[in-house]
Interface confidence: low
């Protein structure tokens, strides 16, 4: 008598979530009499998947009619597959008895469920940093299966190398998550820069999912300050200019002080953007020289993006200006914090 064989021809089957999976099983003989049952997993903790006698398996259907005479095909179809269905499925032959006795198992078919990763979400630092500082960006994607996944970081199209990536959990699971951190060194030119997290997975048919973050959310470019004096006008007024250049973000307050007293405060708004994404701003102050007996100390004070104020001061020499129209443009520059480096 030929020994009964339980044949599961496919070692593994891969199915997209939501699709149906067909698990094939045939037996080589009708003898001995007894049922076939399907289990997920092996050993004492295995899970019953299909048993013709019990009949309460709404998502599992036999491929061929198991009640028909001489049936040797015990393949099943599982509908509406979810990641929770992944595992190794065994077709098991039992000998009829009280109770039925397990006779032989197939080699098993591993069902891997392909589930797409969620759209990567990229988050940046909570506070802005200046050029030459390193900031971290995090990318997360969830819910994918199988576990194999690749994640790459790009800044302006160039792949980043200072990256740390983890896929969790480490062991077998119904689905997986990926979390990656990239460290980026900022430059003053990064206002228009972008970092991209790119996730590639078998379910995406070669089209990676991308999450992006703009470095404009992470960077602060401090302004340069320059104060200049124009030639004296006919009405004994001197035009003093404070040029605030190459700053980002736009949030900036400028205050003029005459001999330490606040003369005027202005807020930057609706400024045109430079090519590199930074802003420039020019403020003018008219000083009536004839109203002063002594030299006038002028200070241009700038508060940028909530940072400590930076000053640029110089003196207008009243003695250098006769009461009639003059043309002297020279001014003593007594600047403090002449370059705004913070």
């Amino acid at each position: 008598e030929e020994e009964l064989q339980v044949i599961q021809p496919e070692k593994s089957v891969s199915v997209a979530a939501g699709d149906s999976a067909t698990l094939n099983c045939t037996v080589s003989s009708l003898i001995p009499v007894g049922p076939i049952q399907w289990f997920r997993g092996a050993g004492p903790g295995r899970e019953l998947i299909y048993n013709l006698k019990e009949g309460h398996f709404p998502r599992v259907t036999p491929v061929s009619d198991p009640t028909k005479r001489n049936n040797m095909d015990f393949s099943i179809r599982i509908s509406n597959i979810t990641p929770a269905d992944a595992g190794t499925y065994y077709c098991v032959k039992f000998r009829k008895g009280s109770p039925d006795v397990e006779l032989k198992s197939g080699a098993g078919t591993e069902l891997s469920v392909r589930a797409k990763p969620s759209a990567p979400v990229v988050s940046g630092p909570a506070v802005r940093a200046t050029a030459e500082h390193t900031v971290s960006f995090t990318c997360e994607s969830h819910g994918f299966s199988p576990r194999d996944i690749t994640l790459k970081w790009f800044k302006n199209g160039n792949e980043l190398s200072d990256v740390q990536t983890n896929v969790d959990p480490a062991g077998k699971s119904v689905s997986y998550s990926i979390r990656s951190t990239a460290r980026v060194v900022l430059t003053r030119r990064d206002v228009h820069s972008q970092v991209i997290c790119e996730v590639a997975h078998v379910t995406l048919q070669g089209d990676p999912l991308r999450g992006t973050a703009n470095l404009s959310e992470a960077i602060r470019v401090p302004p340069f300050l320059e104060v200049t004096q124009q030639s004296m006008r006919a009405d004994n007024q001197v035009n003093v200019t404070c040029q605030v250049t190459k700053f980002y973000p736009q949030r900036l307050q400028l205050t003029w002080l005459e001999n330490g007293n606040v003369s005027r405060t202005e807020m930057a708004s609706a400024l045109p953007e430079n090519k590199d994404g930074t802003y420039n701003w020019t403020s003018w102050l008219l000083v009536n020289v004839s109203a002063h007996r002594d030299d006038v100390k002028l200070t241009c004070q700038v508060e940028h993006d909530g940072q400590p104020a930076v000053n640029k001061s110089f003196s207008v020499k009243v003695s250098a200006h006769p009461k009639e129209q003059g043309s002297n443009t020279a001014a003593e520059n007594t600047g403090t914090n002449e370059r705004n480096i913070y």
């Epitope: 295995r46 899970e47 019990e54 998502r59 979810t82 929770a84 819910g143 689905s175 998550s177």
Partner: antibody, heavy 117, light 109 residues
Framework: EVKVEESGGGLVQPGGSLRLSCAAS????????MGWVRQAPGKGLEWVSI?????SPYYASWVNGRFTISKTSTTMDLQMNSLRAEDTAVYYC?????????????WGQGTTVTVSS | DIQMTQSPSSLSASVGDRVTITCQAG??????LAWYQQKPGKVPKLLIY???TLESGVPSRFSGSGSGTDFTLTISSLQPEDVATYYC???????????FGQGTKVEIK
């Protein structure tokens, strides 16, 4: 017939303990994820705990270590300690679907737990 | 745990009416949503799982839809035997936790 049946409910004083049991017929407890869902009088359903086919326990966040789920080859148990009045409810034993652990397709008739002094 | 918000909390409709119950998850649960029917004094009965799959033996007038955070249970033609409280239930496959909606009581006008 596939069914589950609860036992062990009763009246218990606040701070006391009670052990609920669930017996299965028509299938093996060791082959399925099993769980407990409760329903306070006149209220909605509330998930309590599940135990995987391999015996790993999972709890709702509000359980805070007061309940312990376990199972043998024949019964699934819920050990309830430090009981409070708000734990008064009908406790249902439920079996998760044969393939999808995302739903409960077999429910017992429930056992009533009353916590009162 | 994920918060499940069901609406309305109760409704009254006539026999033959189309009835819609919605359920909103506090975060995405993909399609891991089930619907249950509980008649007064009875045990909950599974109607729909995986958002839209009808459980065996459930009348085809019941249908489910939705994914992510927003889900709907529809009874295409309300019958007297449909008087019950309906619950949605989510499963979060990362935390492996379950959550039920607060229920919708359906009555006949």
């Amino acid at each position: 017939e596939v069914k589950v049946e609860e036992s062990g409910g009763g009246l218990v004083q606040p701070g006391g303990s009670l052990r609920l049991s669930c017996a299965a017929s028509g299938f093996s407890l060791s082959s399925y994820v099993m769980g407990w869902v409760r329903q306070a009088p006149g209220k909605g359903l509330e998930w309590v705990s599940i135990i995987s086919s391999s015996g790993s326990p999972y709890y709702a966040s509000w359980v805070n270590g007061r309940f312990t789920i376990s199972k043998t080859s024949t019964t699934m148990d819920l050990q309830m300690n430090s009981l409070r009045a708000e734990d008064t409810a009908v406790y249902y034993c439920a079996r998760v679907g044969p393939l999808g652990v995302d739903y409960f397709n077999i429910w017992g008739q429930g056992t009533t737990v009353t916590v009162s002094s | 745990d994920i918060q499940m918000t069901q609406s309305p909390s109760s409704l009254s409709a006539s026999v033959g009416d189309r009835v819609t119950i919605t359920c909103q998850a506090g975060q995405s649960i993909n399609s891991y949503l089930a619907w249950y029917q509980q008649k007064p004094g009875k045990v909950p009965k599974l109607l729909i799982y995986y958002a839209s799959t009808l459980e065996s033996g459930v009348p085809s007038r019941f249908s489910g839809s939705g994914s992510g955070t927003d889900f709907t249970l529809t009874i295409s033609s309300l019958q007297p035997e449909d008087v019950a409280t309906y619950y949605c239930q989510s499963w979060h496959y990362i935390s492996r936790s379950y959550a039920f909606g607060q229920g919708t009581k359906v009555e006949i006008k």
